[in-house]
């Protein structure tokens, strides 16, 4: 048993039929010695008396909020959560495996630039009685500070018969230099609690590997005289690291017909303009990627040819 | 249709062209190592990230763009200098700060060159003949060092009397290539910044 937060404890259980469980001793946080009784959750059934209560925790029915009272007054609470281990593996029932970029990916993170700010998100099909807590650091043996906000529900989607909920959190490295060469990864730890079930999930990455720029901005077309060609121009996204001559981007320009089957013309350039042939009913899209370190491409910015 | 990107005129800023070649060469070599040594811990997640230049050169700090010198987190405990203007030591007179930055890059290249050559000598003795260093990468390191045009003593290649442990050597190669790729990215950023200055 270990303390997760003040008055909240996690009991780690080997989960198999007829498992003996864990013996837990709860102590009432009070100077009082006599006349103390214990109850569980909303029940008025007295489980025991005295300053300590010894319980055998085997299943979820044994978890919950244990309260000690004296003469109708609440003295203190101890909330017990269960962490299941099945065949030597901690349960991962709460979050959905996103399977990208590989199996057992429960947390995904992205950064728009090298400022040390990043966003992580995760998916669940659980709609209620759900709490997350996020911690992060740079390195684990001598951790350096990363501050994370509260997790929030960021999207709801219908997937077949199921509803899927996306939660996200923003974190900021306390002292980040955009030009630094990372040698220690960022560690992200998410505590997830559903009803009385506790689980934890972790992710480890370098900011350079999770970079995904915002799409280029101010995408414009300028027709060239007596030609089917147009000059496409754009700008670096506002969120990208500066100076741009140091944190340079490379771009992919695509001409795409109305039909997905039509051949796509693609041009790669380091400049912020390109000359392409604009076909009728086609659209021109531009996306960006770090010029020197091949992490993710941005989403496309698009304009119609007409 | 994938149209290649036009490379800038090398006469304009020789080091930019060489640094781009360097990044391409080290990235290709790293990819080859990851594929060839697929049963060795050679991915970014698996290796220890070591920097052989740590406490010997200070390229990131010495080459910090002027705009980032206001960022407290970039001004570590070391005495930091930063780029102001100029180009590679090709034509125009460069400032003291720039010379410091470029000489730090030169020292990095020299250290990696020695390590890679020593390692290649060991790999050539491997009866499996599984992987060797790309001669193109070694040549590109040499070209950039020449373009930087610093005179410094030649560091003798390390020689070892004991029998090489080929498993350890291959893991060391992965560590070295990952670190050198990261440094090559920094060098490319610096050259791009100088080219724009």
């Amino acid at each position: 048993i270990w303390e997760l937060k003040k008055d909240v404890y996690v009991v780690e259980l080997d989960w198999y039929p007829d498992a003996p469980g864990e013996m837990v001793v709860l102590t009432c946080d009070t100077p009082e010695e006599d006349g103390i009784t214990w109850t569980l959750d909303q029940s008025s059934e007295v489980l025991g008396s005295g300053k300590t209560l010894t319980i055998q925790v085997k299943e979820f029915g044994d978890a919950g909020q244990y309260t000690c009272h004296k003469g109708g007054e609440v003295l203190s609470h101890s909330l017990l959560l269960l962490h299941k281990k099945e065949d030597g593996i901690w349960s991962t029932d709460i979050l959905k495996d996103q399977k990208e970029p590989k199996n057992k990916t429960f947390l995904r993170c992205e950064a728009k630039n090298y400022s040390g700010r990043f966003t992580c998100w995760w998916l669940t099909t659980i709609s209620t009685d759900l709490t997350f807590s996020v911690k992060s650091s740079r390195g684990s043996s001598d951790p350096q500070g990363v501050t994370c906000g509260a997790a929030t529900l960021s999207a709801e989607r219908v997937r077949g018969d199921n509803k899927e909920y996306e939660y996200s959190v923003e974190c900021q490295e306390d002292s980040a230099c955009p030009a630094a060469e990372e040698s220690l990864p960022i560690e992200v730890m998410v505590d997830a609690v559903h009803k009385l079930k506790y689980e934890n999930y972790t992710s480890s990455f370098f900011i350079r590997d999770i970079i995904k720029p915002d799409p280029p901005k101010n995408l414009q077309l300028k027709p060239l005289k007596n030609s089917r060609q147009v000059e496409v121009s754009w700008e670096y996204p506002d969120t990208w690291s500066t100076p741009h001559s140091y944190f340079s981007l490379t771009f992919c320009v695509q001409v795409q017909g109305k039909s997905k089957r039509e051949k796509k013309d693609r041009v790669f350039t380091d400049k912020t303009s390109a000359t392409v042939i604009c076909r009728k009913n086609a659209s021109i899209s531009v996306r960006a990627q770090d010029r020197y370190y091949s992490s993710s491409w941005s989403e496309w910015a698009s304009v119609p040819c007409s | 249709r994938n149209l290649p990107v036009a490379t800038p005129d090398p006469g304009m800023f020789p080091c930019l062209h060489h640094s781009q070649n360097l990044l391409r060469a080290v990235s290709n070599m790293l990819q080859k190592a990851r594929q060839t040594l697929e049963f060795y811990p050679c991915t970014s997640e698996e290796i220890d990230h070591e920097d052989i230049t740590k406490d010997k050169t200070s390229t990131v700090e010495a080459c910090l763009p002027l705009e980032l010198t206001k960022n407290e987190s970039c001004l570590n405990s070391r005495e930091t200098s930063f780029i102001t203007n100029g180009s590679c030591l090709a034509s125009r007179k460069t400032s003291f700060m720039m010379a410091l930055c470029l000489s730090s890059i030169y020292e990095d290249l020299k250290m990696y060159q020695v390590e890679f050559k020593t390692m290649n000598a060991k790999l050539l003795m491997d009866p499996k003949r599984q992987i060797f260093l790309d001669q193109n990468m070694l040549a590109v390191i040499d070209e950039l060092m020449q373009a930087l045009n610093f005179n410094s003593e030649t560091v003798p290649q390390k020689s070892s009397l004991e029998e090489p442990d080929f498993y350890k050597t291959k893991i060391k190669l992965c560590i070295l290539l990952h670190a050198f790729r990261i440094r090559a990215v920094t060098i490319d950023r610096v050259m791009s910044y100088l080219n724009a200055s």
Epitope: V74, L79, L130, T131 | -
Partner: nanobody
Framework: EVQLVESGGGLVQAGGSLRLSCAAS????????VGWFRQAPGKEREFVAA????????RYADSVKGRSTISRDDAKNTVYLQMNSLKPEDTAIYYC????????????????WGQGTQVTVSS
Amino acid sequence: EVQLVESGGGLVQAGGSLRLSCAASGRTFSTYAVGWFRQAPGKEREFVAAISWGGGTVRYADSVKGRSTISRDDAKNTVYLQMNSLKPEDTAIYYCAARVLHIATKAVDFGSWGQGTQVTVSS
């Protein structure tokens, strides 16, 4: 059950700000999630914001998202709702409510309620 007392309401001009407080009695507040609800005259009680035990998860109604921030200070047994860019339609009695552990958006899921604090936004 935990006892709750709201404060910080009042009359404010449109575009102004208010900070509501919800103080809990007892030393056992840290295991509770707290929600803010509001009820305008002749309307149903509606969810505004909620914060979990430990403050690790927050939730906001679409109507206040981006304008409100919920936070908690367990050392003071208090939850705060900072409301900015107030609009006349934010006029209502604001209630705080508590339940063990998890946040919820339905009033029926909360066991303990405060008496409420009046917020009036004039145009």
